[in-house]
Interface confidence: medium
């Protein structure tokens, strides 16, 4: 015999108290798959969290963070304060990137500058705390008599991660 609950679509639950009728999920709850015997409680985006996507009968709410904070963890399980570009967040607060590293966002860690020589290229623009180095043509390409080299386009300003 087929389980009658298998006919209950997402957004409903199989109500054992009502002869296994498919009942709509109550307010502030959802079921994202069919055949559910209960609906799950919607996530509430409170405090430093804000609602990115409202809960519906078939999908949970999604949160991000209020201004000045950004998400951490799967599904934005935590919010932490923004730092400035050129910094990273440590246990002692936001700290400037060490020489040789950069961070072009208000979140995340400082990363080492690109080592242009590993690709046989030269440094065209020096790196800063906020920006990676820009690698140029290889030193051989710049030797006298070499064919002219079209300078690379300016590096695109990187966008911030979604907040």
């Amino acid at each position: 015999l087929q389980d009658p609950c298998s006919n209950c679509p997402a957004g409903t639950f199989c109500d054992n108290n009502r002869n296994q009728i498919c009942s709509p999920c109550p307010p502030n709850s959802f079921s994202s798959a069919g055949g559910q015997r209960t609906c799950d409680i919607c996530r509430q985006c409170k405090g430093v969290f804000r609602t990115r996507k409202e809960c519906s009968s078939t999908s949970n709410a999604e949160c991000d963070c209020t201004p000045g904070f950004h998400c951490l963890g799967a599904g934005c399980s935590m919010c932490e304060q923004d730092c400035k570009q050129g910094q990273e967040l440590t246990k002692k607060g936001c700290k400037d990137c060490c020489f040789g590293t950069f961070n072009d966002q208000k979140r995340g860690i400082c990363r080492p500058w690109t080592n242009c020589s590993l690709d046989g290229k030269s440094v065209l623009v020096n790196g800063t705390k906020e920006r990676d180095v820009v690698c140029g043509p290889s030193p051989a390409d710049l030797s006298p008599g070499a064919s002219s080299v079209t300078p690379p386009a300016p590096a695109r300003e990187p966008g911030h991660s979604p907040q």
Epitope: C45, V48, P67, G68, G93
Partner: antibody, heavy 118, light 107 residues
């Protein structure tokens, strides 16, 4: 306990720059942001901007070209500068701490009245 | 900018009355609303954040509710020290904005 205290000149001439200092105690500057809010006499509250623990700033776009917020961690001080002031900038100016729980203000200074007049 | 419209702008009440102040946002702000109390000549004091969470030390007679665009601050039994002006504030997006205030006066 947590304390914030605003200080600065009570009278500023039109077209000059208003400069205020907020001296704080009782909490760590590496963990908390500080907002500046003003209140013209007999009117409501207006948010000016915030400086976060790492030094990043966010400003009210209506004032963005005129306002600068900075901090000196070694002195436990925050500063507000508002350039090209007019009589409309006459107000009580408050600094207030941002908690770790939301983008709000949980502790406020007592406020300082700044009058713009020649 | 998100406009926060408070009503009424003033109201009179007696000690022991139940009082409700409302705040309407011009667009959905989730539950990212705070309430402040301000007495004459004093700085504002935080009462509620996240629409319904009382700040530490705030008496239980103060409660907040609402989500989306409509929010309320309720004082279940007004005490003499509650006569003040109350402001709502949204922090869902920049710029942070306040309501125009509601002045609670003694009847």
């Amino acid at each position: 306990q947590v304390q914030l205290q605003e200080s600065g000149p009570g009278l500023v001439k039109p077209s000059e720059t208003l400069s205020l200092t907020c001296t704080v105690s009782g909490f760590s500057l590496i963990s908390y942001g500080v907002h500046w809010v003003r209140q013209p006499p007999g009117k409501g509250l207006e948010w000016l901007g915030v400086i976060w623990s790492g030094g990043s700033t966010d400003y009210n776009p209506s004032l963005k070209s005129r306002v600068t917020i900075s901090k000196d961690t070694s002195k436990n001080q925050f500063s507000l500068k508002l350039s090209s002031v007019t009589a409309a900038d006459t107000a009580v100016y408050y600094c207030a701490r941002n908690p770790l729980t939301a983008t709000v203000m949980d502790y406020w200074g007592q406020g300082t009245l700044v009058t713009v007049s020649s | 900018d998100i406009q926060m419209t408070q009503s009424p702008s003033s109201l009179s009440a007696s000690v022991g009355d139940r009082v409700t102040v409302t705040c309407r946002a011009s667009q959905n702000v989730g539950t990212n609303v705070a309430w402040y109390q301000q007495k004459p000549g004093k700085a504002p004091k935080a009462l509620i954040y996240s629409a319904s969470y009382r700040d530490s030390g705030v008496p239980s007679r103060f409660s907040g509710s609402g989500s989306g665009t409509d929010f309320t601050l309720t004082i279940s039994s007004v005490q003499p020290e509650d006569f003040a002006t109350y402001y709502c504030q949204q922090y869902n997006s920049y710029p942070l904005t306040f309501g125009g205030g509601t002045k609670l006066e003694i009847k």
